[in-house]
């Protein structure tokens, strides 16, 4: 009996089309993605194979202007248009807490969400009962098919759930539930979810009775001979892990942003063994047109988003880079440009010993969503910005001991390469990094900004003094791992709104050209 | 609306077989399990088995198991439950119930069949 | 198998009462745990699915609670058409089992 699965994760609000590195199109005949060509690939496929599944596994929330207005209802609205078959619940999709999550997508979609290791507690446990499930079985044919969900147990850290959810750990709360569905005599069972790609390896290993695992929150690309684009592969399509009880099971992802549609083929037995896997992911360019119906709801849906965002607030003159691949390993210019708008917002001349009360910006490389393309006449938008800073925090205001932001730093690269959102961007701040040196001891020289100075110039940073700094709330409030900063900080003040912070300094500026100018080296 | 009609009251002697049928409406029909409970009179509920008429696949409760048979006619949404080898300690109503495939509870019951079995 | 034990099994109570049933599994059922009603002569009526998710229809007095081995069946004030028989049951493994049920008389 074959199965085939077609997968999307991390699609972070990419219902238009998209350019090549999945920021605005600029130029549609070489754009890509979205939810209409998506459709008109689905539907070639159901039409043509007889056993077809489409899975979400996780973080369509969060990533563009379309979540920005509609916070939600767009997803349940368009996953249920494309007749998605179920999905898991990734971290992003509780940005707004978990009423921004119940109202607008779990009540509203016509499909199972997922997850077996989210337990509700208290009033919110009779709120949400059934709204999410463990897994769900699923006819397909004349056969039925079990998905289990899970989601990353780091949720708590990387986004909003609130106190009322606990995230057990993802093997510990998936096992039961894969013996619950052998006990339904269901023998073929994929693991849907959202821990990132380690995870899914391990799941695969660990968890008895899983035939398949479908992933997401890594963004990993994995591809079996020449790629497409410009995304280099983890590994092949499928990647094959050998479970601790000898079987090998396939785990599949489908990088991100819907550029892609992951599309697998599983040959079962008679008694649910996988026999054979095989695919790859499907890049969705423009050989593949938009489905015209689904393209009219886009268009339809879009109105509200053009009064909302389209005005200019300045011109860039150069790529501001804002890819995953640059922010979360070196310094970037889109982290430079934040920075110093970060900076530029606190300007507050109370005292002439100094020339500002605060000269420090970091910022969590992760938080940096998308790159703006300069080619587009150069212009930039609300719409733009919202991509780049999607989640709504604020940039506030702390004082910190040096030895703290010494520790934070550290945090930075303790676990470098593996494109994780740690990585700092700075301003005011130079820092070099010593990678050959062991996780803890990798700061070689950190220098910051004067304050209490009439020429403003670098000094070695103090463990013991207090500093000001500015950075987003989510890092203030120890998120990506930043306990020191949640534990140790000895005053913080709420800010402004991140992206009104950057359009406000845009406005200001007119034209910008932010530059690598050597904050972040390595030696 | 959800219904499941049940077929009228039946007095079998031992040792004989009988064959309860279930109707459904108001849903489709092939997505959900449809679980057989009997009840005994003045006594508790016991589920025998269930058949999935997607793909006909049935889980009998190992008591009734080689004395019950389920069998679906999708073309008339019909579940029938043939219990053989009857015995007096098997006069009960006999109901068929809804459940999911995957989450067994029932949310929708047959009015419910009473069998006698006596000499 | 696993077994399902209701206490009490029966109990007399007045209109407006709080009523508690309780219900132990003899193994962990992992939440999944459906409460049922039923009159004299009827069908039973599912109230509660997954300890605590209310069915459509059914009065808010009626709640749930638990994990693990150990749930409750709360009756926050008790109505005339509440007297009946009640049976928890288990569907976290086949074969799914019921409570011995517990009965609701008028005091």
């Known amino acids: 009996w074959e199965l085939t699965i077609l997968h999307t994760n991390d699609v972070h609000s990419r219902l238009e089309q998209t350019s090549e590195d999945s920021s605005k199109c600029v130029n549609a005949s070489r754009c890509m993605g979205g939810v209409a060509r998506l459709f008109t690939k689905v539907q070639q496929i159901r039409r043509a194979e007889p056993n077809v599944l489409l899975l979400d596994a996780g973080d369509q929330y969060q990533g563009t202007i379309w979540f920005t207005v509609y916070k939600g209802a767009e997803v349940a609205h368009f996953m249920n248009a494309l007749r998605y078959d179920a999905m898991a619940l990734g971290n992003h999709e509780f940005d707004n807490g978990v009423e921004g999550l119940i109202e607008p997508l779990l009540k509203e979609a016509k499909f199972p969400i997922l997850s077996a290791n989210i337990k509700a507690k208290g009033p919110l446990a009779s709120q949400i009962s059934g709204l999410y499930l463990p897994y769900k079985v699923l006819p397909v044919g004349d056969e039925v098919v079990g998905i289990v969900g899970y989601t990353s147990k780091e949720t708590p850290f990387l986004s909003n759930p609130g106190t009322n959810l606990v995230f057990e750990d993802e093997i510990t709360a998936l096992q039961p539930e894969v013996d619950k569905l052998k006990t339904l005599n269901v023998n073929k069972i994929i693991a849907l979810g959202h821990s990132g790609f380690e995870m899914d390896k391990l799941i695969a290993q660990k968890v008895r009775g899983v035939d398949v695992v479908v992933g997401g929150h890594s963004n990993t690309f994995l591809y079996t001979g020449n790629p497409p684009s410009k995304e280099v592969p983890a590994g092949k399509y499928p990647f094959i892990v050998t479970s601790d009880d000898g079987r090998k099971v396939p785990v599949v992802q489908a990088y991100a942003f819907g550029k892609y549609l992951g599309y697998l083929k599983i040959e079962f037995d008679e008694r649910g063994n996988v026999i054979s896997s095989h695919g790859n992911p499907i890049l969705l360019n423009s050989s593949i047109p938009e489905d015209p119906s689904i393209k009219a709801d886009i268009n339809k849906w879009r109105i509200k988003l053009d009064n909302y965002s389209t005005q200019e607030l300045g011109k860039t003159i150069v790529y501001l880079d804002g890819s995953s691949q640059s922010c979360r390993f070196r310094e970037c210019n889109m982290g430079n440009l934040i920075c110093d708008a970060m900076i530029n917002n606190n300007l507050r001349h109370t005292d002439e010993m100094f020339w500002n009360h605060v000269s420090m910006c970091i910022l969590n490389g992760g938080g940096i969503r998308s790159p703006i393309d300069e080619r587009n006449n150069g212009t930039i938008t609300w719409e733009n910005l919202a991509a780049v800073l999607p989640f709504g925090g604020t940039f506030d205001l702390v004082q910190l001991k040096g030895s703290t932001l010494k520790k934070a730093f550290e945090h930075s690269v303790h676990r470098y390469g593996q494109s994780t959102g740690e990585f700092l961007q700075v301003g005011g701040i130079h820092v070099v990094y010593d990678l050959s040196r062991k996780p803890g001891d990798r700061v070689v020289k950190l220098d910051v900004l004067c304050t209490k100075c009439r020429v403003p110039s670098y000094d070695p940073l103090k463990m013991d003094e207090v500093y000001k700094v500015i950075l987003p709330n989510f890092l203030a409030n120890g998120g990506d791992g930043f306990q020191m900063i949640k534990d140790e900080l000895l005053r913080h003040d709420s800010g402004d709104q991140d992206i009104n912070v950057v359009s406000t300094y845009i406005s200001k500026m007119k034209v910008i050209y932010p530059a690598v100018e050597g904050r972040i080296k390595f030696s | 609306q959800v219904q499941l009609v049940q077929s009228g009251a039946e007095v079998k002697k031992p040792g004989a077989s009988v064959k309860v049928s279930c109707k459904a409406s108001?849903?489709?029909?092939?997505?959900?399990?449809m679980h057989w409970v009997r009840q005994a009179p003045g006594q508790g509920l016991e589920w025998m088995g269930a058949?999935?008429?997607?793909?006909?696949?049935?889980s009998y409760a190992q008591k009734f198991q080689g004395r019950v048979t389920m069998t679906v006619d999708t073309s008339t949404s019909t579940v029938y439950m043939e219990l053989s080898s009857l015995r007096s300690e098997d006069t009960a109503v006999y109901y068929c119930?809804?459940?999911?495939?995957?989450?067994?509870?029932?949310?929708?019951w047959g009015q419910g069949t009473l069998v006698t079995v006596s000499s | 198998d696993i077994q399902m034990t209701q206490s009490p099994s029966s109990l007399s109570a007045s209109v407006g009462d709080r009523v508690t049933i309780t219900c132990k599994a003899s193994e962990g059922i992992y939440n999944r745990l459906a409460w049922y009603q039923q009159k004299p002569g009827k069908a039973p009526k599912l109230l509660l699915s997954g300890v605590i998710s209310l069915e459509t229809g059914v009065p808010s007095r009626f709640s749930g609670s638990g994990s693990g081995t150990d749930y409750t069946l709360t009756i926050s004030s008790l109505q005339p058409e509440d007297f009946a028989t009640y049976y928890c049951q288990q569907y976290w493994s086949i074969p799914w089992t019921f409570g011995g049920g517990t009965k609701v008389e008028i005091k």
């Open positions: 108001g849903y489709t029909f092939t997505t959900y399990n």
């Open positions: 058949i999935f008429p997607g793909n006909g696949h049935i």
């Open positions: 119930a809804r459940g999911d495939y995957d989450e067994s509870y029932f949310d929708y």
